[in-house]
Amino acid sequence: HIAEDTSDLLQYVKFQSSNFENILTWDSGLESAPDVVYSVEYKTYGKKEWLAKEGCQRITRKSCNLTTETGNHTEHYYARVTAVSAGGRSATKMTDRFSSMQQTTIKPPDVTCIPKVRSIQMIVHPTSTPIHAEDGHLLTLEDIFQDLFYRLELQVNHTYQMHLGGKQRDYEFIGLSPDTEFLGTITISVPNFFKESAPYVCRVKTLPDRT
């Protein structure tokens, strides 16, 4: 190996992970590098053998979905990319150690907000992940993070908010005025892993009082 500066071929190889969907991304130092092809390998911590990722060999795009290959959420992984230019120059770069449990970000929850006359019901739908349990079913975020809870806030007016929270999926803000618009925000929190999702936002109006 003759050392040379190949930083213009390949930079910033990293995992981008959201709800355990793990995408490997990278960049070239050049504005455009149409003659450069990329090949991806991955491995688990302490394994000697790098495995070639099928479908990500000699590609021109700068991302590769490694969700299936990195599907054990208790494992640590590495990935590396080799860039080869038409002129024969090559560069290999690897990621830092990747743990999806530690590094995945949480997307906003999927929530149904149901207005009633004097209350608003909020039903949080479980977020499934691509991770399979031993029996083959897909795990939810709740399955993976034992300490996961939901934080709900209802903006009543500029100065007053109501708060609810817990592990259950069904909530109701009560004692509201009929025929009034409210802004609800619902976030997922995983304190042990210092994770918090961006909020799901629903703007709902309580029903008019017909009595």
């Epitope: 190996h1 302490g46 560069a91 290999t92 830092d96």
Partner: antibody, heavy 116, light 113 residues
Framework: EVQLVESGGGLVQPGGSLRLSCAAS????????MNWVRQAPGKGLEWIGE????????TYNQKFKGRFTISVDQSKNTAYLQMNSLRAEDTAVYYC?????????WGQGTLVTVSS | DIVMTQSPDSLAVSLGERATINCKSS????????????LAWYQQKPGQPPKLLIY???SRESGVPDRFSGSGSGTDFTLTISSLQAEDVAVYYC?????????FGQGTKVEIK
């Protein structure tokens, strides 16, 4: 064939500094983690720290954090160990060793003697 | 830090006889993800760097003679040389890679009786 060659060792006075080099050949240094391990005369092995040469991310044995710094020059395919505020007890053979968990390739080592 | 303790400190064995080195860790080295143990063994001859013999407690490094074997789980591990050869005279070290900082045992010196 993978080879690691350390250099830069020698005699240094207490309080002095030294930079050790580890030149890798037979592979791209950015393809695997690199570690530094030391061995005092007649003693056992002590892990100093590691670097991901691709990203520059380092992890240190707390014992050496602050005094020792690991870095890489990708264009030279070389890793470095910068040692500051050296003491007599830092006298040892310093090895670079490849891999992220156990160490599959080692250099021959370079001797650092801290003495006045 | 995980403390690695080897026994004995030195060992004299006749040529062709079995040599057994023990290594005990201060906490379990069982890696839950793959149910393997994060333990390696090295051989170091005078004036040379250590040489990897065994990783994952029992996987032999390529090119290492099959008279070397590793066993054990959790906190107790063993390196066995089934039939000691003259070229096996060396110091042997265990190393954990379960958590930072990686730590080594103090070494066991193997000599010929």
């Amino acid at each position: 064939e993978v080879q690691l060659v350390e250099s830069g060792g020698g005699l240094v006075q207490p309080g002095g500094s030294l930079r050790l080099s580890c030149a890798a050949s037979g592979y791209s240094i950015t393809a695997e983690y690199m570690n530094w391990v030391r061995q005092a005369p007649g003693k056992g092995l002590e892990w100093i720290g590691e670097i991901n040469p691709s990203t520059g991310t380092t992890t240190y044995n707390q014992k050496f954090k602050g005094r020792f710094t690991i870095s890489v020059d990708q264009s030279k395919n070389t890793a470095y160990l910068q040692m500051n505020s050296l003491r007599a007890e830092d006298t040892a053979v310093y090895y670079c060793a490849r891999f992220d968990a156990y160490f599959d390739y080692w250099g021959q080592g370079t001797l650092v003697t801290v003495s006045s | 830090d995980i403390v690695m303790t080897q026994s004995p400190d030195s060992l004299a064995v006749s040529l062709g006889e079995r040599a057994t080195i023990n290594c005990k860790s201060s906490q379990s080295l069982l890696y839950s993800s793959n149910q393997k143990n994060t333990l390696a063994w090295y051989q170091q001859k005078p004036g040379q760097p250590p040489k990897l013999l065994i990783y994952w407690a029992s996987s032999r490094e390529s090119g290492v003679p099959d008279r070397f074997s590793g066993s054990g789980s959790g906190t107790d591990f063993t390196l066995t040389i089934s039939s000691l050869q003259a070229e096996d005279v060396a110091v042997y070290y265990c190393q954990q890679y379960y958590s930072y900082p990686f730590t080594f045992g103090q070494g066991t010196k193997v000599e010929i009786k």
